[in-house]
């Protein structure tokens, strides 16, 4: 597994990065783990990156991910919120120039090298459905979330709001 070498080197000034003219409103460097405390790790294999969900050994370092937060208007005004209907979208980057992408055709989560502006597949709506846990909903496919399947990350369709607390789509962020 690889981590980001040197937080300072990678945590750019907020105004340095822009996506279609929009800068992230904040950024965090955090490790990502499942609801059941398994770590999300990233490994270079055959010149491409693989994503794993695994138990780490006691003193093994957790991989870090840069989460960039963007504001987005809610697509509909049904709520009556008018201009205030904002959502937070995030992009997740475990190493420079690579971002998590939703591959909706394959129902998979992949790491792709790409330049800005990032494609919509790299954006996920942030949900805090549960105390201290977050979920990531595909911008390109509402109702589909990043989840855990067979020790890998996959895209999982959530049919109703009752299922939004399903453990396999809940993740913990830790900045330590």
């Amino acid at each position: 597994a690889f981590g980001i070498s040197g937080v300072q080197k990678y945590t750019r000034a907020l105004h340095d990065s822009s996506i279609t003219g929009i800068s992230p409103i904040t950024e965090y460097l955090a490790s990502l783990s499942t609801y059941n405390d398994q770590s999300i790790t990233f490994a270079l294999e055959d010149e491409s990156y693989e994503i794993y969900v695994e138990d780490l050994k006691k003193d093994e370092k957790k991989d870090k991910v840069l989460l960039s937060y963007y504001e987005s208007q809610h697509p509909s005004n049904e709520s009556g919120d008018g201009v205030d209907g904002k959502m937070l979208m995030v992009t997740l980057s475990p190493t420079k120039d690579f971002w998590l992408h939703a591959n909706n055709k394959e129902h998979s989560v992949e790491l792709h090298k790409c330049e800005k502006p990032l494609p919509d597949q790299a954006f996920f709506v942030l949900h805090n459905m549960h105390s201290n846990c977050v979920s990531f909903e595909c911008k390109t496919d509402p109702g589909v979330f990043i989840g855990v399947k067979d020790n890998h990350l996959a895209l999982i369709k959530v049919d109703s709001s009752e299922n939004l607390c399903t453990e396999n789509i809940l993740f913990k962020l830790s900045e330590t």
Epitope: I25, T26, E78, S79, M87, L88, M129, S131, S161, L164
Partner: antibody
Framework: QVNLLQSGATLVKPGASMKMSCKAS????????VSWVKQSHGKSLEWIGE????????NFNKEFKDKATLTVDKSTSTAYMELTRLTSEDSAVYYC???????????????WGQGTLVTVSS | IIVMTQSPKSMSISVGDRVTMNCKAS??????IAWYRQKPGQSPELLIY???NRYTGVPDRFTGGGYGTDFTLTINSVQAEDAAFYYC?????????FGGGTKVELK
């Protein structure tokens, strides 16, 4: 427009409990976290805790974990806070608040109720 | 718990003045700061979030700045309605904490 309407001022005796309400309107109640904030007379603000109406999930400031209970009634779009074993230290204005974002709590308080004054006195 | 310290505690200014108040965090909080104004007898209102983002409908005379531990709120050309308490707050992480406030009075 977004409105958080809180219940009226209350005088309670030391040792008693009381429950205040916060009726939300003008937005989708279940999609936003609701927080509660305390302001003692002439003092600053203290965050008590938050609840997500959709799931009932909540987070608390440790200082208030044994003092406050947060609940919601989705059918009436109302959030409640019950305070127990009241002492003079609990005399304050209590605000319910809502953040700016659907689905996500960043513990930012974009909308505020008018406040409920609680006076604890025998 | 991260402690937020505001200065000055109070200031007396005239309409049209430019005023800057400070907020210091006891440890690095990135840009996770919000500012609120509380007029006498009213509920607080959100002015700035994530250190420098003006909230919807907030006049552009309000500007937030800073990163890490030191933050400022500047009011360009103070209006009569700006006589109020101003609070900074650490956001994002639980528990969020507020500063003790800066009171802005008009001469």
């Amino acid at each position: 427009q977004v409105n958080l309407l809180q219940s009226g001022a209350t005088l309670v005796k030391p040792g008693a409990s009381m429950k205040m309400s916060c009726k939300a309107s003008g937005y989708s109640f279940t999609d936003y976290w609701v927080s509660w904030v305390k302001q003692s007379h002439g003092k600053s603000l203290e965050w008590i805790g938050e609840i997500y109406p959709n799931s009932g999930a909540n987070n608390f400031n440790k200082e208030f974990k044994d003092k406050a209970t947060l609940t919601v009634d989705k059918s009436t779009s109302t959030a409640y806070m019950e305070l127990t074993r009241l002492t003079s230290e609990d005399s304050a204005v209590y605000y319910c608040t809502r953040g700016p974002y659907y689905y996500s709590s960043q513990i930012i308080f974009a909308y505020w109720g008018q406040g409920t004054l609680v006076t604890v006195s025998s | 718990i991260i402690v937020m310290t505001q200065s000055p505690k109070s200031m007396s200014i005239s309409v049209g003045d430019r005023v800057t108040m400070n907020c210091k965090a006891s440890q690095n909080v990135g840009n996770n700061i919000a500012w609120y104004r509380q007029k006498p007898g009213q509920s607080p209102e959100l002015l700035i979030y994530y250190a420098s983002n003006r909230y919807t409908g907030v006049p552009d005379r309000f500007t937030g700045g800073g990163y890490g531990t030191d933050f400022t709120l500047t009011i360009n050309s103070v209006q009569a309605e700006d006589a109020a308490f101003y609070y900074c707050q650490r956001i994002y992480n639980s528990p969020p904490t507020f500063g003790g406030g800066t009171k802005v009075e008009l001469k």
